[in-house]
């Protein structure tokens, strides 16, 4: 730690006199403090010399000296007190700014130490300090407002007695600066505009801070537009507004508009784009193909897209058919708008039943017209299988008809035993049906196929299976001669045998 | 060792606020004084002003109506102000630090700020 | 029009001496020590001098400084090429209340 010399807390001297203040450490010091006029400074290796050969009341203060290569940051400090009897005060500043909740030092520092016992703070002109300032004097340093507040932010004047009168002390401007969290904080009204030429508009940009230094403005297409501003404060911001009025807009109205507004802290922009159009519009669109397909049972949501200006007159969704006339429940639509201009409608459609397949249409209308989007709805279905023997131009002939969608495809076994089912270890042969004939094949209906298999001859103790599948599912009917006769069954069923 | 930054936009518009920023590094605000000197093209150096830790300031009596000098000791930063500018405010403005007898023992860099509409 | 008073130009050849003047009044330089900066082209400035004739740590003994009432002067011996740049002269002033500079001398090392 450095060592002054000499080597007290406090020296009191009068104006006029030499004072020589001398600072040792084991490397370089220096000698730092309140900037103030008259004083020398000599380095001499690893001492350093602060004098001045006729002190004046400007040199009070504390001055402390430190060793810049010491890591432990050590320092020693002494207070000059320069008791001039015509100036009790030393101002270092006439102007203090601090932010908010900040402890504020008006340093006006006592040139006589034994003045202390008399100290007061004003405001300038005599005037009280304010209810509730909370401060503390120090002679060293001054008067500290503590926790300063915006209200604050007054001329204020040290007051000291001297043989039973008051001396004043220079004023002090304290500037107490509200904490400005960030850039303004900015709305623009509406977030999107569609006007039809000639109808009226209005933008409005508004930004408001804690502090009423911040700039505004609005800007069309990078055109900074001339508005006069309205300013307010209220739930203690300050809000500054500018309304563009537009009687009848045209094409050239139209494009982006920016609120665009700044502080010290920043910049904050938003945007918003005007459209202008001739006339109303009603475009429906969705993000799914118009063409659905679900297997039964399961659930759809049926979603519309809706952009229209100016807004819907009406909608409904309406089932066009047709296995059926009953109509969509009011419970299962649903409207969520996603801003001014766009609309989503949902036709939700849970555990679908096979009445339930057909048309689907969303209407809507406004002066613009009506317009109409349609979904087609068809079920898919696994597929049902059945076999009948019969004779066909005199050949025995195996029957099976499936029925499901998509179309089935048909496969044939014959194997070994008597079974349900053909696995794998017992099957004999195996026949494809490529093109199976289509029986019936009309839309949002299962398609029937039927296949068939010319047996010359049936053998007893084997099965023949009739296999359909489609991307829903499978289906199977297995065909067990008996002499007594032929007997079919679809897997799974038990087996009687009279 | 202490490094001084000056920050802020180099372009301002007539009649608007000049704001720079100089942030300290290296060391604590919270000892010395704090100054911002400027130098227009082709001219001198000029003192603007200076604040000292606790937030006391002294300006350049010129400029004295159209400044702001403040700290902010949380961030090791002080601020300069300037407002109502014109181009006359052109210039590189510098941030340093003050010692005891006026001396400005490190600086910063230097910031361009032209002031033009 | 600057405070205190400098040459707006000086020049030497390399090994020379030259000395650059700084001329105020009693309210500055009379009554204030001096400080001096040296500003190469494109960088910041840098204190050469304060106190009227201390040198800071890493300003070469080349470079000396004097007072002499409301005078001051910079001296550079042994001039060299990276000399070459711009040199200020600065005061407190008390009846400004402010730092002074002078308008600065430009050294050209020929």
């Known amino acids: 730690i450095p060592v002054i010399e000499p080597s007290v807390p406090e020296l009191v001297v009068k104006p006029g006199a030499t004072v020589t203040l001398r600072c040792v450490g084991n490397g370089s010091v220096e000698w730092d403090g309140p900037p103030s006029p008259h004083w020398t400074l000599y380095s001499d290796g690893s001492s350093s010399i602060l004098s001045t050969n006729n002190a004046t009341f400007q040199n009070t203060g504390t001055y402390r000296c430190t060793e810049p290569g010491d890591p432990l940051g050590g320092s020693a400090a002494i207070h000059l007190y320069v008791k001039d009897p015509a100036r009790p005060w030393n101002v270092l500043a006439q102007e203090v700014v601090v932010f908010e909740d900040q402890d504020a030092l008006l340093p006006c520092l006592l040139t006589d130490p034994v003045l202390e016992a008399g100290v007061s703070l004003v405001r300038v002109r005599g005037r009280p300090l304010m209810r509730h300032t909370n401060y503390s004097f120090s002679p060293w340093h001054g008067f500290t407002i503590h926790r300063a507040k915006f209200i604050q932010s007054q001329d204020y004047q040290c007051s000291a007695l001297m043989g039973g009168r008051k001396v004043m002390s220079i004023s002090i401007r304290l500037k107490v600066q509200k904490v400005i969290p960030g850039p303004p904080a900015l709305t623009l009204v509406p977030a999107e505009l569609v006007r039809i030429r000639g109808e009226a508009a209005q933008i409005v940009c508004s930004a408001s801070s804690v502090d009423v230094n911040f700039d505004v403005f609005l800007q069309h297409n990078n055109t900074k537009l001339a508005i006069p501003q309205q300013s307010d404060f209220h739930n203690n911001r300050y809000q500054k507004v500018l309304t563009l009025n537009l009687d009848q807009v045209d094409f050239q109205h139209a494009g982006n508009y920016s609120c665009v507004a700044s502080n010290v802290q920043g910049k904050h922009s938003t945007s918003m784009f005007f459209r202008v159009v001739e006339s109303a519009y009603l475009n429906l669109s969705s993000e799914q193909n118009l063409i659905q397909e679900v297997t039964v049972g399961e659930g759809l949501n049926l979603k519309v897209m809706v952009e229209a200006y100016p807004g819907l007159q009406g909608f409904n969704w309406t089932y066009l058919g047709p296995f059926s006339d009953h109509q969509p429940e009011p419970k299962l639509a649903n409207a969520t708008t996603k801003d001014t201009y766009r609309h989503t409608f949902t036709l939700s459609l849970p555990r679908l039943k096979p009445s339930e397949a057909g048309r689907y249409s969303f209407l809507a209308r406004n002066p613009g017209g009506w317009r109409a989007l349609t979904f087609e709805l068809t079920l898919r279905y696994p597929p049902e299988v059945s076999v009948i023997w019969t004779f066909i131009n005199g050949s025995g002939t195996l029957l099976c008809a499936a029925s499901g969608y998509p179309q089935p495809n048909v496969t044939w076994l014959q194997c070994s035993g008597h079974t349900d089912r053909c696995d794998e270890a017992q099957v004999l042969q195996v026949w494809d049906d490529p093109y199976p004939e289509v029986l019936s094949q009309e839309p949002f209906h299962k398609v029937t196929v039927q296949s068939l298999l010319t047996v010359e001859t049936l053998e007893h103790n084997q099965t023949y299976e009739c296999r359909a599948h489609n991307s829903v599912g499978s289906g199977s009917w297995a065909f067990i001669p008996i002499s007594a006769g032929a007997h079919t069954h679809p897997p799974d069923e038990f087996l009687f045998t009279p | 060792q202490v490094q001084l930054q000056e920050s802020g936009p180099g372009l301002v518009k007539p009649s608007e606020t000049l704001s720079l920023t100089c942030t300290v590094s290296?060391?604590?605000?919270?000892?010395?004084?704090w100054n911002w000197i400027r130098q227009p093209p082709g001219k001198g150096l000029e003192w603007i002003g200076y604040i000292y830790y606790i937030g006391s300031t002294n300006y350049n009596p010129s400029l004295k109506s159209r400044v702001t000098i403040s700290v902010d000791t949380s961030k090791n930063q002080f601020s300069l102000k300037l407002s109502s500018v014109t181009a006359a405010d052109t210039a590189v403005y510098y941030c340093a630090r003050g010692r005891l007898t006026y001396a400005f023992d490190i600086w910063g860099q230097g910031t361009m700020v032209t002031v033009s509409s | 029009q600057s405070v205190l008073t400098q040459p707006p130009s000086a020049s030497g050849t390399p090994g020379q001496r030259v000395t650059i003047s700084c001329s105020g009044s009693?309210?500055?330089?009379?009554?204030?020590?001096v400080n001096w900066y040296q500003r190469v082209p494109g960088t910041a400035p840098k204190l050469l001098i304060y106190s009227n004739d201390q040198r800071p740590s890493g300003v070469p003994d080349r470079f000396s400084g004097s007072k002499s009432g409301t005078s001051a002067s910079l001296a550079i011996s042994g001039l060299q090429s990276e000399d070459e740049a711009d040199y200020y002269c600065a005061a407190w002033d008390d009846s400004l209340n402010g730092v002074v500079f002078g308008g600065g001398t430009k050294l050209t090392v020929l």
């Open positions: 009693s309210s500055n330089i009379g009554s204030n020590t």
């Open positions: 290296g060391g604590s605000i919270s000892i010395y004084y």
